[in-house]
Amino acid sequence: EVEKTACPSGKKAREIDESLIFYKKWELEACVDAALLATQMDRVNAIPFTYEQLDVLKHKLDELYPQGYPESVIQHLGYLFLKMSPEDIRKWNVTSLETLKALLEVNKGHEMSPQVATLIDRFVKGRGQLDKDTLDTLTAFYPGYLCSLSPEELSSVPPSSIWAVRPQDLDTCDPRQLDVLYPKARLAFQNMNGSEYFVKIQSFLGGAPTEDLKALSQQNVSMDLATFMKLRTDAVLPLTVAEVQKLLGPHVEGLKAEERHRPVRDWILRQRQDDLDTLGLGLQG
């Protein structure tokens, strides 16, 4: 903590400007009024303060707002956000998407830090649900964001938000997460016609039950092997050879290359050899 010392004559800051970079830490502490800093936070990012100087500025804000910063200050924190701890952020009440975007921009290009994770958690909890605009914003900055949520957290995603989800946002989701997301996607896309529906639902099919896969097999969807490999084992096992052939269409030949991998291996094992032979792929049950 910076020692309390009187501000030297003529050094009292009238505004936040470039001259402050020449101030020693104790001078910043003594000569910069916290209330002035709070009202001119937007200027801080344009000034090349050292990390040590930023520590002083943070300390001044902490003293002014012991219960947590107001959103008017948070929105303009800029690089000072990187100095915040998760404990600091837990005191905040962030409601504006613009504030969230401004802070995510500071961390752009880096992995999600504990600070960012706490910020997002506070924001989403404040909103009560993960709405479409928020999801759009978060997945733009962190494509893996959705798959970092627990199944319980995903249950707060309204079906309307599913429209914001891109296939790459689901790349790292596990079966438990897709089990939650699939019914929401099914609901969100229910009014689309066959081929359009399949394009949209395809990324979510890792959560689909057997009945839905059987229904898709009747619609000439030509599912690719990459999608088939992501299906739930328990959903695939009851499918007949004829149903899998219809589901995959021309991609059925790809089963041979995946015969040693799950869930293809599990499915092959449970089929009658006579039925497998009809595929002409040399699959051994």
């Epitope: 438990r176 096992l237 449970r270 049950g285």
Partner: antibody
């Protein structure tokens, strides 16, 4: 509740064939979702999967043991068996039989049987 | 075959500690990785399946995460009964393989 019990000789001579049987109780070896595996653990070492069988008779073996391993199933007795030929001292281990549920993993294990290869 | 490399091979920890064990697959195992606990003289016990699903009857202090090649088993607050050896295992490829094991000992 499904239980597994290994049985067989505890001592086998080098170059002979090791034979073990696993008896399934409280459930059926003919279950649709399950495969039945043999796994071994040499003293003080880690686990090594040997192979599995499905009730239809389809098998899948560890490539490093494939030439010496035969796993068979007897649905009428609710048993499956392991034969490992041309054994050496390196085959000395605790041998476990285990059920693998396709949706989970090796969720049920026998208590294991120690087999020593020595003359 | 897919090789499973576990680390550390052993660790010392105290009751109440948070313990993390990692397992790296030599090629993608998708999410088909399971975790087992084994105590001396006993058969292994399934803790986590499909990378992150908790096996029925297993305490919630155990959790798993990961996909592709990197997997983690976490014990949030180590209990006296948790001192044991832990193994990861992949079942994505038909040739199942186990990690070398991690022995968790009392500090």
């Amino acid at each position: 509740q499904v239980q597994l019990q290994e049985s067989g000789p505890g001592l086998v001579k080098p170059s002979e064939t090791l034979s073990l049987t696993c008896t399934v109780s409280g459930g059926s070896v003919s279950s649709f979702t399950d495969t039945w595996s043999w796994i071994r653990q040499p003293p003080g070492k880690g686990l090594e999967w040997i192979g599995y069988i499905y009730y239809s008779g389809s098998t899948n073996y560890n490539p490093s043991l494939k030439s010496r391993v035969t796993i068979s199933v007897d649905t009428s007795k609710n048993q499956f068996s392991l034969k490992l030929s041309s054994v050496t001292a390196a085959d000395t281990a605790v041998y476990y039989c285990a059920r693998e549920d396709a949706l989970t993993g090796f969720d049920i294990w026998g208590q294991g049987t120690m087999v020593t290869v020595s003359s | 075959d897919i090789q499973m490399t576990q680390s550390p091979s052993s660790l010392s920890a105290s009751v109440g500690d948070r313990v993390t064990i990692t397992c790296r697959a030599s090629q993608s195992s998708r999410y088909y990785v399971n975790w087992y606990q084994q105590k001396p003289g006993k058969a292994p016990k399934l803790l986590i399946y499909a990378a992150s699903s908790l096996q029925s009857g297993v305490p919630s202090r155990f959790s798993g995460s990961g996909s592709g090649t990197d997997f983690t088993l976490t014990i949030s607050s180590l209990q006296p009964e948790d001192f044991a050896t832990y193994y990861c295992q992949q079942s994505y490829d038909a040739s199942y393989t186990f990690g070398g094991g991690t022995k968790v000992e009392i500090k």
